[in-house]
């Protein structure tokens, strides 16, 4: 019991301190005294809840103490001088000093004051995020991964996408123990739409200033989806010549573009060069109907195309095409 | 060497009071809160109260409150602990000790009768 | 007040035995308990402060544990130099108070 009138003692320390696994952090406690108060310290202690016994103890004559020497120190307080920093050192942190820890001052004449500190035990995880290359297969799969690798807590992962799709999200043990791994998958329905189109993957950790982000190229893998152009219905006979474009999307790129008709090889006023056909120019009318089959990895495609080359006003002489 | 060397035993009667010397030398007297501690013959040991020497600020056990005075003379480097008010059960051997949390240093002891 | 109930009051041992004096607070006094040595006809002796840190000086021999309310003192192998009765003390709170003491004897 203090004597009456007596302005109290007050021990100052943050209610929680973060340190990373590995690393050393600074448990801070002091002893704040009022302007007229007097105040005699003789010892330090520093204890961890339910754990029988002190950590560590400085005494006004004996100096420090510690029950794991190698691991524990005192910062600030020395013998010969005023006890009044109890701020205590940890080295090689480990998962297993996470807790609550009791820093308490020995005092004339007030007695005994004290204030708990909560050590949380951080580790900053590593993130990456990879595309999950797919196929064509009318149901949902992953197209993206995200990994936080060996964080503690866990790291929050999410998404953002505007192609719709959902997160698939599993924890598993890190690789030192207490940490954790959390891996994120983006689910959704392959189409060529989505090919080269991206999503983010945004990891959250009390170890960040601010939230990872890590973009995905999607890669989807599909045939060909083709089309031809270049025909506008208003070729005419003794026009200049023309070009008809077989246009193809996929993934991978076409190996091949094989031009036909259906009455079987192409005639000899057509000329195949690759994703193109040449139409010469001709001096009667013709109603063909084109064919356009374009080959990858994953098949084949075509698409079909009439042209007619009518006899028309020769007043225009821009040729077949408005190419 | 830390000593703590007090004053000699005392006979006194029921209603007297007694003051007991503790002389310390071998360390730096204001650094440290002198305590005083009682022993009954063959009995546990009582604490009594204690008085830091800088600015004579004092805690006492509440069972002695207004019969006992802790003081200090820091030109001699000296505490004195006065209890008033005697009565029997008062025998005992009357220490000062040295405080550090604990008792790190004590004195030889000095024994107070009371008796009529 | 904080109680502090010492057992045994009183205990017989041999040199070289193993022994162990336990102290019981009436509550938490955390890791604040001291425990001493009294010899016949002289002061208390500090051996072990905060539950559990040898005083320099102190043969190694003599251990402290616990916290909370549960203490311990622990003599690992009994000396004749030994015989004397053991006090704790919590400086936790005011006011300071002691257990009533052991008594060792050497048999």
């Known amino acids: 019991w203090p004597p009456p009138g007596t302005g109290d003692i007050i021990v100052q320390a943050p209610t929680q301190v973060p340190g990373f696994l590995g690393d050393s952090v600074t448990l801070p406690c002091y002893l704040q005294v009022p302007g007229m108060e007097e105040t005699h310290v003789s010892q330090l202690t520093w204890s961890r809840h339910g754990e029988s016994g002190s950590m560590a103890v400085f005494h006004q004559t004996q100096g420090p103490n510690y029950s794991e020497p190698k691991r524990l120190e005192f910062v600030a307080a020395r013998l010969g001088t005023e006890l009044r920093d109890a701020s205590l050192r940890m080295f090689g942190l480990r998962v297993e000093d996470e807790g609550n820890y009791t820093c308490l001052f020995v005092t004339f004449p007030q007695g005994s004051r004290s204030v708990d500190i909560w050590l949380r035990v951080l580790a900053k995880p590593q993130n990456t995020a990879e595309v999950q290359k797919v196929q064509l297969t009318g149901k949902p799969v992953p197209v993206a991964r995200c990994v936080s690798t060996g964080g503690r807590p866990p790291a929050h992962i999410t998404w953002h996408s505007d192609l719709g799709g959902m997160p698939n999200t599993s924890q598993a043990p890190g690789f030192l123990s207490g940490t954790v791994t959390v891996t994120s998958l983006w689910i959704l329905v392959p189409s060529s739409q989505v090919d080269g189109k991206s999503v983010t993957c945004k990891v959250e950790h009390e170890s960040f200033e601010k939230p990872q982000l890590l973009t995905v190229n999607l890669t989807v893998y599909y045939p060909p989806e083709v089309s031809i152009s270049g025909y506008d219905n208003n070729w005419y006979l003794s026009q200049n010549e023309a070009t008809l474009t077989c246009d193809a999307r996929s993934n991978p790129e076409p190996t091949g573009y094989n031009w036909s008709t259906t009455m079987g090889p192409l005639p000899p006023f057509a000329v195949a060069q690759g994703a193109q056909l040449l139409i010469r120019p001709v001096d009667k009318p013709i109603n063909t109907t084109f064919i356009c089959n374009v080959t990858n990895a994953l098949g084949a495609r075509q698409a079909e195309l009439t042209v007619q080359v009518k006899e028309g006003p020769p007043s225009e002489p821009s040729g077949m095409s408005s190419n | 060497e830390v000593q703590l060397v007090q004053s000699g035993s005392e006979l006194k009667k029921p209603g007297a009071s007694v003051k007991i010397s503790c002389k310390t030398s071998?360390?730096?007297?204001?650094?440290?809160?002198m305590h005083w501690v009682r022993q009954p013959h063959g009995k546990g040991l009582e604490w009594i109260g204690g008085?830091?020497?800088?600015?004579?600020?004092?805690s006492y056990n509440q069972r002695f409150k207004g019969r006992v005075t802790l003081t200090v003379d820091k030109s001699t480097s000296t505490a004195y602990m006065e209890l008033s008010s005697l009565r029997s059960e008062d025998t005992a051997v009357y220490y000062c000790a040295r405080w550090t949390g604990d008792f790190d240093y004590w004195g030889q002891g000095t024994l107070v009768t009371v008796s009529s | 007040d904080i109680q502090m109930t010492q057992s045994p009051s009183a205990m017989s041992a041999s040199v070289g035995d193993r022994v162990t004096i336990t102290c019981k607070a009436s509550q938490n006094v955390g890791t604040n308990v001291a425990w001493y040595q009294q010899k016949p006809g002289q002061p208390p002796k500090a051996l072990i402060y905060?539950?559990?840190y040898r005083y320099s000086g102190v043969p190694d021999r003599f251990s402290g544990s616990g916290s909370g309310t549960d203490f311990t003192l622990t003599i690992s192998s009994l000396q004749a130099e030994d015989l004397a009765e053991y006090f704790c003390q919590q400086y936790e709170s005011y006011p300071y108070t002691f257990g009533q003491g052991t008594k060792l004897e050497i048999k």
């Open positions: 905060s539950a559990s």
């Open positions: 008085i830091h020497p800088n600015q004579g600020e004092t």
């Open positions: 071998g360390y730096t007297f204001t650094e440290y809160t």
